[in-house]
């Protein structure tokens, strides 16, 4: 039994690091393998992760961590019974994939404005809490070409857009993801999407001027 692709790990910089690797043949990861991990620090204990299968020869392990600081370094040992298959190390701060934002809500109670809000996936004591920026993806269920991304580069987890920038009378979906420049993270997964029906009515005068204005462009 040999490791074909060495473990690579990403951290959510809070409590979970996920390591994936491939073996040289079909493997029952949970019965045949163990990934031992230990923070390089005083008093730290070795922990054992029981991997799960991820395809025929692939394995994945979710390493649980109490907390994380920038300087953290973990030793990783992959065992098959008494045989050490691979030894390595992992610095969570150098391989961060943020948690996905949650609770995405579209507020349509203001007739001409859509307010999208979501929750920061980190608690205030986490460094990433104040360092996330977001991308909001809005698309039409009726028209695959009607697909847009809004970059939210401020800290507040919200986005305001004019309802008139979207087509009226059709359904849209939105989702949001996060990243942090400070640790050069990858993007998080997308949040679950939320759906709403976009309907707005402009007063006749405004409607008239709008088209007049549009004509000049």
């Amino acid at each position: 039994m040999k490791v074909l692709q060495e473990p690579t790990c990403v951290s959510d910089y809070m409590s979970i690091s996920t390591c994936e690797w491939k073996m040289n043949g079909p493997t029952n990861c949970s019965t045949e393998l163990r990934l031992l991990y230990q923070l390089v620090f005083l008093l730290s204990e070795a922990h054992t992760c029981i991997p799960e299968n991820n395809g025929g020869a692939g394995c994945v392990c979710h390493l649980l961590m109490d907390d994380v600081v920038s300087a953290d370094n973990y030793t990783l040992d992959l065992w098959a019974g008494q045989q050490l298959l691979w030894k390595g190390s992992f610095k969570p701060s150098e391989h961060v994939k943020p948690r996905a934002p949650g609770n995405l809500t579209v507020h349509t109670n203001v007739s001409d404005t859509l307010l999208l809000t979501w929750s920061n996936p980190y608690p205030p004591d986490n460094y990433l809490y104040n360092h996330l920026t977001y991308a909001v993806n809005i698309w039409s269920e009726n028209d695959p070409a009607d697909f847009r991304i809004y970059n939210v580069t401020y800290l507040e987890p919200s986005l305001r857009i004019a309802a008139s920038t979207l087509k009226s009378g059709i359904s849209y979906r939105a989702r949001v993801r996060a990243w942090a420049q400070c640790y050069n993270t990858t993007w998080s997964e997308w949040s679950p999407s939320t759906k709403w029906h976009n309907s707005y009515r402009e007063p006749f005068e405004q409607h008239h001027h709008h088209h007049h204005h549009h004509h000049h462009h």
Epitope: S15, F41, L42, L43
Partner: antibody, heavy 116, light 112 residues
């Protein structure tokens, strides 16, 4: 041996500022969060705030926001706390504590007395 | 802020007898990572506090096995199975799950 050695007792006048130090030995403060805890005479323990020494990220209990400023110098392996606009109610023993992820190591405490 | 309420505030125990201290949090102290950072500290007279129990039930290294922690949700207990003279001092519970972190008001244990 792991130790947190704090600077000595201070007597200050109301309105003054004091800066307490906490030097770590036996471990690198970059590997922990450094916290400060207040203990007024005859009273209990009060969490003040903490710093991640590597990136300087601090959080404070709202009561100590604007009163306490926590800093760290990783080159000297030392954490600091500055208390400003001192008043008589700031008279207390202040403990530095390393947390990873519990308070395993405490400094001996620094008594700050505010008196005119 | 989460308020940690300890009972009783003082306790007088005969050596060899058990002792129990309760700590109740004003709301859940389960961290968003799923762990409960409830700890117990003992401050002996003239000393800095020392860690006894972390994550509700785990004894810190060097802590005698007569100390045990239990509980979940908002109700937690520290038990000393047989009190010894060296156990005197003030016991504090602490929650490190939600900012601002908070201590209980302390329980003073004395020997009869």
């Amino acid at each position: 041996e792991v130790q947190l050695v704090q600077s000595g007792a201070e007597v200050k006048k109301p309105g003054a500022t004091v800066k307490i130090s906490c030097k770590a030995s036996g471990f690198n403060i970059k590997d922990t969060y450094m916290h400060w805890v207040k203990q007024a005479p005859g009273k209990g323990l009060e969490w003040m705030g903490r710093i991640d020494p590597t990136n300087g990220y601090t959080i404070y209990a709202s009561k100590f926001q604007g009163k306490a400023t926590i800093t760290a110098d990783t080159s000297s392996n030392t954490a600091y706390m500055e208390l400003s606009s001192l008043r008589s109610e700031d008279t207390a023993v202040y403990h530095c504590v390393s947390r990873r992820p519990w308070f395993a190591y405490w400094g001996q405490g620094t008594l700050v007395t505010v008196s005119s | 802020d989460i308020v940690m309420t300890q009972t009783p505030l003082s306790l007088s125990v005969t050596p060899g007898q058990p002792a129990s201290i309760s700590c109740r949090s004003s709301q859940s102290i389960v961290h968003s990572n799923g762990n409960t950072y409830l700890e117990w500290y003992l401050q002996k007279p003239g000393q800095s506090p020392q860690l006894l129990i972390y994550k509700v039930t785990n004894r810190f290294s060097g802590v005698p096995d007569r100390f045990s922690g239990s509980g979940s949700g908002t109700d937690f207990t520290l038990k000393i199975s047989r009190v010894e003279a060296e156990d005197v001092g003030v016991y504090y519970c602490f929650q490190g799950s939600h900012v601002p972190y908070t201590f209980g008001q302390g329980t003073k244990l004395e020997i009869k």
